[in-house]
């Protein structure tokens, strides 16, 4: 059995979740892939994904998360810039494979995010922001609905403790229009 | 409980080559980057080279790159750093760490290996 | 490559004081930034990583603040197991992974 993990990550509201998810370049490389959420109880649900097929380095926007596939590199980089409370969660990447299910990349991510002050003096992330800042021109896309017989019967669990799964493919549904957009350096 | 086993260090003179292994176990090898990381006596830490657990790529410091080639073999759970063209400022205790799966961080660090290169 | 630059390099605190330790970086790495301690003769621990988040089993007197180029590691009641090297990493964009030069935690 393959064993779920997470990483924890805790942080302040205001700063940047900045995460690598490693995948086989000879299968995946232009494969379209996502980043999720998995809340209490439901089935993951999909915030973002990349172009079908996958562009290298192109970066995509969706409201604050931003999604760059380097297919050279064989990584996913996703950034959840100006974190806010709320974005507290669980989260994965997966590649959509149809016909087949998403395929999972490890580990999960335990995301807390806290109020409070992030930075020190002379601190400057937020100059970085400036760059995500959504240009006016959208362009309206959706990403793949998988549905599954299965359901949940159980949450995730919030500990880091390992999980016991009897594979590496996890289901999705309950995806919602998403809004994806170019990024301009 | 997760272990890194480094061996294979030792005096070479200059211009020699050294292999140097870190067996692991404790945790899914395949599926996690695994990088080197050296120190000098009494110097401070320096990363030389990474390998990914999916993707296989690999990255190498400026100082070693050209020189020295980073392995693995998933079925063996083995790590390995081939060391050509040793110098007399590649003397440095040489420690394997894995890391996490989102980030090149280390987590854990094997006790490491001395290798000195000296005439 | 982006240089981490550790402050001070040597500090001499009292058990039971609170420690300080400072590092820049020489560009914004966001939150990408970790902490770790040497003990000699021993290999690195990591403790702290996401600028903030500690590591497991890491005690909570160990802490971690910054974002962007300015961190801190802050040690609120120095025990007699934390005097050592501390070392500060950037894990941001891409290799070369970077760390400061440490700061040596010294008995006063």
């Known amino acids: 059995a393959t064993k779920l993990t997470e990483e924890k990550y805790e942080l302040k509201e205001g700063q940047t979740l900045d995460v690598k998810c490693d995948y086989t370049l000879e299968k995946f490389a232009s494969s379209q892939k996502a980043w999720q959420i998995i809340r209490d109880g439901e089935m993951p649900k999909t915030l973002a994904c990349t172009e079908r097929p996958s562009k290298n380095s192109h970066p995509v926007q969706v409201g604050r998360i931003i999604l760059e596939d380097y297919h050279d590199h064989g990584l996913l980089r996703v950034r959840m810039v100006n974190l806010q409370v709320e974005d507290s969660g669980l989260y994965q990447c997966v590649i959509y494979q149809p016909p087949k299910e998403p395929h999972m990349l490890f580990d999960r991510i335990r995301l807390v995010v806290t109020k409070g002050f992030s930075g020190t003096p002379g601190s400057n992330e937020n100059s970085t922001q400036n760059v995500y800042k959504i240009p006016p021109t959208t362009t309206k896309a959706l990403c793949p609905l998988y549905t599954s017989p299965r359901t949940v019967t159980q949450a995730p669990p919030k500990s880091t403790a390992d999980v016991s799964t009897p594979d590496s493919e996890i289901n999705l549904t309950n995806v919602t229009d998403i809004i994806r957009v170019p990024v301009f350096n | 409980e997760v272990q890194l086993l480094e061996s294979g260090g030792g005096l070479v003179q200059p211009g020699g080559s050294l292999r140097l292994s870190c067996a692991v176990s404790?945790?899914?090898?395949?599926?996690?980057?695994m990088s080197w990381v050296r120190q000098a006596p009494g110097k401070g830490l320096e990363w030389v080279s990474e390998?990914?657990?999916?993707?296989?790529?690999?990255y190498y410091a400026d100082s070693v790159k050209g020189r020295f080639t980073i392995s693995r073999d998933n079925s063996k759970n083995t790590l390995y750093l081939q060391m050509n063209s040793l110098r007399v400022e590649d003397t440095a205790i040489y420690y394997c760490a894995k890391e996490f799966s989102s980030n090149s961080l280390f987590d854990y660090w094997g006790q490491g290996t001395l290798v000195t290169v000296s005439s | 490559e982006i240089v981490m630059t550790q402050s001070p390099a040597t500090l001499s605190v009292s058990p039971g004081e609170r420690a300080t330790l400072s590092c820049r970086a020489s560009?914004?790495?966001?939150?990408?930034l970790a902490w770790y301690q040497q003990k000699p003769g021993q290999a690195p621990r990591l403790l702290i990583y996401g600028a903030s988040t500690r590591a497991t089993g890491i005690p909570a007197r160990f802490s971690g603040s910054g974002s962007g180029t300015e961190f801190t590691l802050t040690i609120s009641s120095l025990q007699s197991e934390d005097f050592a090297v501390y070392y500060c990493q950037q894990f941001y964009n891409w290799p070369p992974w970077t760390f400061g030069q440490g700061t040596k935690v010294e008995i006063k």
């Open positions: 390998m990914r657990g999916s993707s296989g790529s690999t």
């Open positions: 560009q914004s790495v966001n939150a990408n």
């Open positions: 404790g945790f899914t090898f395949s599926r996690y980057a």
